[in-house]
Amino acid sequence: MAERAALEELVKLQGERVRGLKQQKASAELIEEEVAKLLKLKAQLGPDESKQKFVLKTPKGTRDYSPRQMAVREKVFDVIIRCFKRHGAEVIDTPVFELKETLMGKYGEDSKLIYDLKDQGGELLSLRYDLTVPFARYLAMNKLTNIKRYHIAKVYRRDNPAMTRGRYREFYQCDFDIAGNFDPMIPDAECLKIMCEILSSLQIGDFLVKVNDRRILDGMFAICGVSDSKFRTICSSVDKLDKVSWEEVKNEMVGEKGLAPEVADRIGDYVQQHGGVSLVEQLLQDPKLSQNKQALEGLGDLKLLFEYLTLFGIDDKISFDLSLARGLDYYTGVIYEAVLLQTPAQAGEEPLGVGSVAAGGRYDGLVGMFDPKGRKVPCVGLSIGVERIFSIVEQRLEALEEKIRTTETQVLVASAQKKLLEERLKLVSELWDAGIKAELLYKKNPKLLNQLQYCEEAGIPLVAIIGEQELKDGVIKLRSVTSREEVDVRREDLVEEIKRRTGQPLCIC
């Protein structure tokens, strides 16, 4: 045991030695030799029997975020939050777990993906599956009938995710919802406008927002001969049309879900259509569909929606798609989903979707499910699929080989000579107190070269250098890391000069 501990210590020391040599930019031969030694030490260490059984990893469908990934995430969140705030939203938060009863019966076939927690003193609890149901519970509990809010938090789904495509079991959702009784389609149009603003701002590529209405779907199923009990299950089949062919969907509906082939064919005639407002007009003339009250209401609202979307200047981004049948049970009206488009291989081909990056819709009955008297609070909202967006942004930055800053430090307080630690500490404290983002190296007498190197690696734009002479003269040498130009700045002017150079407001407002 003592021998293993000694060997582990040597592995640690050798690892430090290798890192040190690399930092010092030692000769390639020396580094190669010391790396070879490290590998030989590790080989002797072999597997630790006590640790062998336990593989150190994050649970399936989860991941850690490195500083680089966090920097990407912060930028994405910043774009989203600024947009939500621009549209006047307040922010709320809710517990990460809810009473199991709260989540039951809200998600249809997706309910099997809810994480249940072990017994917690008699309460049956589940991790939240989305942010919408907790929001509805919050409205009902607090008897709220009117709110525009956003909520950014992690949700949990016992999925079998393809993590390479930005799918996880624990992931962030960014939700924006408008609750309240308003004139038709105005809040819905604003939600679509927000979706388009965010996706455009993130510059992740061309996108298309598919729009449909639950009432149109339900009306269509009714006139095609689908029984009420099969509506939801047929919906989930139709929703797969963006991923698989109509033949496969039809086979599932007929073979697995017991639908008559002629009923499936009638559904196929409708759900394979997509277009703009002209398709809405066309369906309003459809002799069968226009006779269905629900479908007629849905089509009327969609016509109005397209008017507002034109006024918002986003009608070119919207496609009325009858195959959109989002799987969640709680939608009652307009539903929408944004997909990124891959550039077609040949001109004239249909644009190809590469997965949903945002979605939402109207859910007028959800709050009523929690109200003892069944009082309804109409709601409409959207959810941004940020995990997929993080993956896309990360891949794009890697492809461009862009260096991402993981800190916001504006200036490093450095010294050119020894025995100036006290002066550095005093100066860095002054800068912090003035709201400047500043750092110093945690060494008594760091070499100036090491300090400048640290700035280059961390992307710190400025170095405030203290020297014996500068102290006597009451100045600080301010050096630009990129241009390497140095100027003497009076100590009392330093804060202002740093703020001026880094474009920071001169007062902390």
Partner: antibody, heavy 120, light 107 residues
Framework: QVQLVESGGGLVKPGGSLRLSCAAS????????MTWIRQAPGKGLEWVSY????????NYADSVKGRFTISRDNAKNSLYLQMNSLRDEDTAVYFC?????????????WGQGTLVTVSS | DIQMTQSPSSVSASVGDRVTITCRAS??????LAWYQQKPGRAPKLLIF???SLQSGVPSRFSGSGSGTHFTLTISSLQPEDFATYYC?????????FGQGTKLEIK
């Protein structure tokens, strides 16, 4: 048993040459870095040279660089030190030693030493 | 080169005494330090490596501590067979250097 045995020491005139050998037994010789360390009479220890198990890496103290050559024959479990242009100050007991944990520059097994005397 | 300085050069002590020998490096060597014992006409014997790890077969009365530039070898209760010369050695960078030695004599 695990041991190192040096041989080849003796009296040699300044400018002369000598070849020291070190026979290893009881361990997998080719896995270990090996080293020559010397000790002048009544003095301290000085690291002379080392060689890695694969022959790939060697190094020499400045005092012997260009005059001494370290080598090994893994098939024969033997380490060698070829000493040319010998000087008075090379007079010492020469120890061969193996590195602790194969690659760490600390001698955990030493030979008994062989005396080299350089004198006219 | 890294210089290693041992103190004292010699020390007199009796059986049962606690003895401490110090070794200083001219620059930081982390824990890359070994202690050896050498008896007249014999090869050095490794006692401690990595500053504080006891070599297999060495009695537990020997212990090492320190890191950076300051290291100590302690013999908690001297035994008759412990009277010898002790050397420290840095294994941080080549040329690997030894201290000048500390002779432990019977009082």
């Amino acid at each position: 048993q695990v041991q190192l045995v040096e041989s080849g020491g003796g009296l040699v005139k300044p400018g002369g040459s000598l070849r020291l050998s070190c026979a290893a037994s009881g361990f997998t010789f080719s896995d270990y870095y090996m080293t020559w360390i010397r000790q002048a009479p009544g003095k301290g220890l000085e690291w002379v040279s080392y060689i890695s198990g694969s022959f790939r890496y060697t190094n020499y103290a400045d005092s012997v660089k260009g005059r001494f050559t370290i080598s090994r024959d893994n098939a024969k479990n033997s380490l060698y030190l070829q000493m040319n242009s010998l000087r008075d100050e090379d007079t010492a007991v020469y120890f061969c030693a193996r590195y602790v944990y194969q690659v760490v520059a600390i001698g955990d097994l030493w030979g008994q030493g062989t005396l080299v005397t350089v004198s006219s | 080169d890294i210089q290693m300085t041992q103190s004292p050069s010699s020390v007199s002590a009796s059986v049962g005494d606690r003895v401490t020998i110090t070794c200083r490096a001219s620059q930081g060597i982390s824990s890359w330090l070994a202690w050896y014992q050498q008896k007249p006409g014999r090869a050095p014997k490794l006692l401690i490596f990595a500053a504080s790890s006891l070599q297999s077969g060495v009695p537990s009365r020997f212990s090492g501590s320190g890191s950076g530039t300051h290291f100590t070898l302690t013999i908690s209760s001297l035994q008759p067979e412990d009277f010898a010369t002790y050397y420290c050695q840095q294994a941080k960078s080549f040329p690997y250097t030894f201290g000048q030695g500390t002779k432990l004599e019977i009082k």
